[in-house]
Structures are given as C-alpha cells and as structure tokens.
C-alpha cells in the first residue's frame, strides 16, 4: 500500500524506485500544482513550547504557544492526512506504569488521533527501532483503527535511532521540534518547536524526509547508494525557500541527518548548524539537552570536537558572544560536565572572548513518580541572523548515525514591528530561560549534585 497523501500530489510509478521500495511511495514534484499551491500559500510560523508543570516564570516574561494546544489545533485543521515521525510513542500514563493527572493531555491527544481515523483522515506513523517505549500500546491502538505504522530499523541500517519529531498535515502544515509523542512532553518536560501553517512548499519538502523513513520501514529495506530523484530537495542552505510569513520576507529550509538519509539537495543537519554558527557576528545562544564533544552510543567513546570547535572559533576568532544552556535532570550523564567546564574556561572578557555555560534545572518537586522527566529537552540555537530549531542533541551520533531534522529560518528585520522576527522571538525565549532562577552557572553546579534543584 502507499501512504495516502493529498490528492494534488503525483504518485511515483514503481519503475521510478528500486523494486524493494514498491511498498512505499515518494512525492513527485508537480510544478503546475506547486505553482497553484504557492499562490494559495500564506505561510505562518508560530513558536510553540511546553513548560513543565510547577515551573513558574517571572510575570510578564515572553512565552510561546503551549505545545499541547498547538497539536490539538493542528489535528482539528487536518482534512486528509497526518504524517508523524517520532522516536517513540507514550501518550498514556499506564504505558509507563504511572497514575498522574498530568498525563491527561497526552491521553486527550491519543483520543483525538483516534477520532481523526474515525473521520477517514489517514494517519501514517514512522517510528524508531530501537525505541524507548517498548511497553507502549499507542501504536497498536491506532493501527487497529486504521493507522499505517512503520518501524524504521535505524539500529540495523545506520547503528542509530530515528530521533526526528515532526508532523506533516495535509501536505500544508508542519510541526517540528524537540517533543516526542509522549504525554510527558506536554506537561513534564521543557520543549521547544515550531508550527508552520499554510506552507505547502515547505510541508512537501519535509514530507520528502518522511518518505525516506517510510521506504526504509519496509521489511528487509536497505539504504540506497543514491536516493531517487523524487526524494531530492529543492530547498537547502544555498537555495532556501523564499516566502512571506505573515507578510514578513522569510527564508527557510529543512536539514536532515544522518548523511545517508540526505538525498540530493538536502543540507546535512551538522552543516546547517555550522553554517548558522559561522554566519553569526554578534551572538550564538543555544539551548540543548545534551552537549558532548564525543560519541555517545559507541564503545569506547570517540572524541568529536566539531561543534565545540565551532563555538570556540566564533567566540575567540570573531568576538561572538556564546551562551550555552544545557539540560540537567536526574537522568543526565554527569560525564558531560567536564566538557562544559572546558568550554566555559575559554571565556576571557578582557580579551573580548565571551563564553558562558549554564545548566537548566527543572525542579522535580512532587513529580518524582514520573521517570525520565523534569528536564529541558529543547534543541535550538539562535543568532542575530537566524533561528535553528532541531531534534538532535549535540554529540556525534546524532549527526552521523541518527535520523533527525533541523529548521533554519531567517527573517528580515525592519520589515515589521521590532521584536517580531522569528530569531528575535527565539532570542527572547532563550533570554527568559537564561536569566531565570532555574539556569545555574557551572560554579553553582558542583560535581555530585546530580542536577537536583537546590533553589
């Protein structure tokens, strides 16, 4: 069978793809349709976030749309198809043996997805093998109601996982960001993402990445030496999408990892990150759950200083102000801290070298019954020029073997009221977190504290 898709998309004929891929299909580019669609496009980008329960912000501080609200809205918008890529699914409390009222939003989302299927809207899910949620029944429940589900064997194919988290709705709307399909992502974990509405060009481009997962989810799938042309991207760092987002001139493109899942024209995720860092002249602010200039999932670990070097070079060579805000929770690997201290040690204000590192600690409070939660899970970066919103933690595996995506957006300042560009909105969210009492300098994060809130 083929993933149902909006009717305006062409179907690839079996002769266009290797025989082993005939179970799947990929979008064909139809210039006339695309042109018609572009005229109807009125792209809009909304930043979305989850703030864990009982994590109050200072009054009047900036905020983004709540993620749970945005997801439910997207599903209300759906008319034909919803395609979801997610590392794992765990939308109900019983999935993880937890009885907690904060799981209700996830359970409502699962209900909404079932209702969607009842309305004859197609749901296609690409998820990872290996996965974290081996006891979850979400996907069985959805499959029983007609959802199409494929496990992508990234462990076998690339020795990684499918770590992407994105939706494509009706080939027109997009969610992408740090949040997995997990109830904790809505109420117990700090997340950051973006929803793009009415933007079929970008949606269809991201759909091509979904299709790379889809064809790899058939039995005995192998990685192609070269991806067929219909998987190629027209938008990349050299040729981004140009459009008006709410009337604001905007360039945007999606990047992907690992390289083996980057068909022609697709910018590699690492290259996108480095390009955004490299173009910064004033500041680089990054908020990531993990920062390791090493591999994470291979024995023994290898040193991998690519991102570390880029931050150091920006700070030391160009006087760019670097701020790194790293997640810190009960399940944070403490071997990360020496690398953070090493980066911070480069800072030398007298020589105009500014590198600051903090950890963001979400107080556990009375939520200790919820495992793998209460952490800043965001993966974004902002400079004065661009916003980068990703799905990857910052260590080698996420760029070399693990499937992820990134979104790079640049908006023209001056064409709209001050503070309205995406990069300015993201900077404000970063600075809110950076200046909050939950952001702790490394000096205040003594070894052995295990990321426990000392507030």
């Amino acid at each position: 069978w083929q993933v149902p898709r909006p009717p305006t998309w062409g179907q690839v004929q079996p002769k266009d793809v290797p025989r082993s891929w005939e179970h799947g299909s990929s979008p064909a580019w139809e210039p006339l349709e695309a042109e018609a669609r572009q005229q109807r496009d009125s792209c809009q980008l909304v930043l979305v976030e989850s703030i864990p329960q009982d994590l109050p912000s200072a009054a009047g501080s900036p905020s983004a749309q709540p993620l749970g609200q945005a997801w439910l809205q997207l599903l209300d918008t759906a008319q034909e198809s919803v395609h979801v890529a997610s590392y794992y699914w765990s939308l109900t409390g019983p999935d993880i043996g937890v009885n907690d009222s904060s799981s209700q939003l996830g359970e409502a989302l699962l209900q909404k997805l079932q209702q969607l299927l009842g309305r004859n809207i197609s749901l296609a899910v690409a998820t990872s093998s290996p996965t974290l949620a081996r006891t979850s029944t979400d996907l069985q429940v959805l499959a029983a109601r007609g959802a199409h589900v494929r496990q992508v064997p990234m462990g076998r194919l690339t020795r990684g996982v499918l770590h992407s988290k994105f939706w494509v709705v009706d080939g027109r709307h997009i969610y992408m960001g740090s949040a997995n399909m997990d109830w904790r992502s809505l109420t117990q974990v700090k997340e950051l993402g973006a929803v793009i509405y009415n933007c079929s060009h970008l949606a269809q481009d991201l759909e091509k990445t979904f299709q790379t997962y889809w064809v790899l989810g058939v039995p005995k799938a192998v990685l192609p030496k070269t991806w067929p042309q219909n998987f190629s991207s027209h938008f990349n760092r050299f040729q981004p999408f140009h459009g008006l987002f709410d009337g604001v001139p905007t360039t945007a493109y999606f990047s992907a990892s690992p390289p083996a899942l980057c068909p022609q024209g697709r910018t590699r995720d690492l290259e996108a990150l480095l390009a955004v860092m490299g173009s910064a002249q004033e500041f680089i602010y990054a908020s990531v759950m993990e920062y390791f200039p090493t591999t994470r999932f291979s024995h023994p670990p290898r040193y991998w200083p690519v991102l570390d070097n880029a931050l150091r070079a920006a700070a030391f060579g160009k006087g760019v102000r670097v701020r790194l805000l790293v997640g810190c929770g009960l399940n944070t690997d403490p071997t990360m801290f020496p690398y953070l201290r090493s980066l911070q040690a480069l800072s030398n204000p007298a020589a105009n070298v500014s590198v600051d590192v903090k950890v963001f600690i979400v107080p556990v409070g009375n939520h200790s019954n919820i495992p793998f939660s209460r952490v800043n899970h965001s993966k974004f970066m902002v400079t004065e020029k661009a916003a980068y919103i990703g799905t990857s933690n910052w260590s080698e595996d996420y760029f070399s073997s693990t499937a992820g995506v990134g979104l790079v957006v640049t908006q023209s300042p001056g064409a709209q009221p001050a503070g309205a560009t995406v990069q300015e909105q993201l900077r404000q969210l970063f600075e809110r977190d950076w200046s909050s009492r939950y952001a702790v300098g490394l000096d205040g994060q003594a070894p052995g504290q295990d990321c426990v809130w000392q507030g």
Epitope: Y87, S129, P130, T131, L132, R134, T135, Q151, G155, R156, V161, H163, M289, E290, R296, F297, G327, G329, L330, N331, T332, D333, P334, S368, N369, P371, F372, V375, H377, N393, D450
Partner: antibody, heavy 124, light 107 residues
Framework: DVQLQESGPGLVKPSQSLSLTCSVT???????YYWSWIRQFPGNRLEWM?????????NYNPSLKNRISITRDTSKNQFFLKLNSVTTEDTATYNC?????????????????WGAGTTVTVSS | DIQMTQTTSSLSASLGGSVTISCRAS??????LNWYQQKPDGTVKLLIY???RLHSGVPSRFSGSGSGTDYSLTISNLEQEDIATYFC?????????FGGGTKLEIK
C-alpha cells in the same frame, strides 16, 4: 571502578526468609541505573528477580511477586534482597548487578557490572 | 514471559578456530538482545548489547547477529581464555529473561 559485592547467610531453613545485601562502591545507587538481583540455579539457569531503581521504585519478576522485596540504604550505598517463605527450590547463587545506563534517550540497556555472587542453600 | 532458548548446552571447538552459539526467543524481541560470558570461577561479563554492539574492552573476535526471534554469537580465532559459559538475555520486556547457557570447551 564500580564494584558490587553480595553478602548474607549461606544457609537458610525452609519457610524462613532469605536476606542478602549488595554493597556498591565506585558509583551512587541513587544515580542512573536499575540495581538488580539475579540468581543462578544449580544447572546454570539464570533468573532475574527484580530491581530497585535509582529513584527508589521497584519492579519484580511476577513469579516471585508475593515473596520478594528489594530495598536500599542510600547512606551506605547498599541495596537489599528479602525473599520470604523459602523452599529448597530457592537454593541458588545470588548475584547483584546493575542495569542501564538510564540516561535520557538511551535505548540500550544491559547488565554491565555483576557481583561475584553468594551461594545460598535452603535446607533444614 | 519471553522464553529464551539456547538449544546447545555445550560444544567444543579448537583453539584458533571459530564457533557460533545460537539463541532463540519465544517471540520477536526486535534486536533487544545481550550476550554475557560466565567464566568457570563464576565471574560474569557483558560481551555484546543490542544484538551486535561490542561492549568496552571486549575483543573484536566476538561478534553478534540476528533479528526477530533468532540470534547468534560468533567467536573467531578461539583462545584458551574463551573457555566459559555464554548466556543470551532479552531486554525487550520485563521480566528480563536469559537463555539456559552454552558451555564452550576446547577440543
């Protein structure tokens, strides 16, 4: 270097309780792992009995559910096994082991450190 | 519970040769399989996790493969120190379960 060492009586009478201690050095039992008990019966068969998590929560093998309790003392970095109403069928070598690592996002779990084991005979 | 079966309880091979030990699960465990070595003195050591990934410090003579319900551990260029019993273990679901073990002897 992380080390686990089991201790406790080598002989227990039927119907009594078996109590063992696992002393952990080189790593905090409040961090990042499940701390398990695994036993090996004469003839080599291994049985996972249960764990206490870094956060103090438990999970037990359903075959032992009504008889087993795993607790801990974080100040001494020790965790304990108590098995009630033992019979001769519980004669085995008892090992403690850690399973993980339970870092965010890591899907690969394994028993990477084992104790040497302590032999317990149930006999009157 | 998932049953893990190692049909061969013991086998012998020559030094320098190679040997394959197999393990079968009662249902698909989706590659969530680990291999352990237990020396004659009772010491247990992790060799391979997630079907085929070598743990730190384990010689590359050890390799693992498999999928679905069928898995295997191969030891090539056998050395005297490989005399041990080898166990498979699934971590797909709780309770964790182990195979019955395969004892390796040198001819």
């Amino acid at each position: 270097d992380v080390q686990l060492q089991e201790s406790g009586p080598g002989l227990v009478k039927p119907s009594q309780s078996l109590s063992l201690t696992c002393s952990v050095t080189g790593y905090s039992i409040s961090s990042h792992y499940y701390w398990s008990w695994i036993r090996q019966f004469p003839g080599n068969r291994l049985e996972w009995m249960g764990y206490i998590s870094y956060d103090g929560s438990n999970n037990y093998n359903p075959s032992l559910k009504n008889r087993i309790s795993i607790t801990r003392d974080t100040s001494k970095n020790q965790f304990f096994l108590k098995l009630n109403s033992v019979t001769t069928e519980d004669t085995a070598t008892y090992n403690c082991a850690r399973e993980g690592p339970l870092y965010y996002g890591n899907p690969y779990w394994y028993f990477d450190v084992w104790g040497a084991g302590t032999t317990v005979t149930v006999s009157s | 519970d998932i049953q893990m079966t190692q049909t061969t309880s013991s086998l012998s091979a020559s030094l320098g040769g190679s040997v394959t030990i197999s393990c079968r699960a009662s249902q698909d465990i989706d590659n969530y399989l680990n291999w352990y070595q237990q020396k004659p003195d009772g010491t247990v050591k992790l060799l391979i996790y997630y079907t085929s990934r070598l743990h730190s410090g384990v010689p590359s003579r050890f390799s693992g493969s498999g999928s679905g319900t069928d898995y295997s551990l191969t030891i090539s260029n056998l050395e005297q120190e490989d005399i041990a019993t080898y166990f498979c273990q699934q971590f797909n679901t709780l309770p964790r379960t182990f195979g019955g073990g395969t004892k390796l002897e040198i001819k």
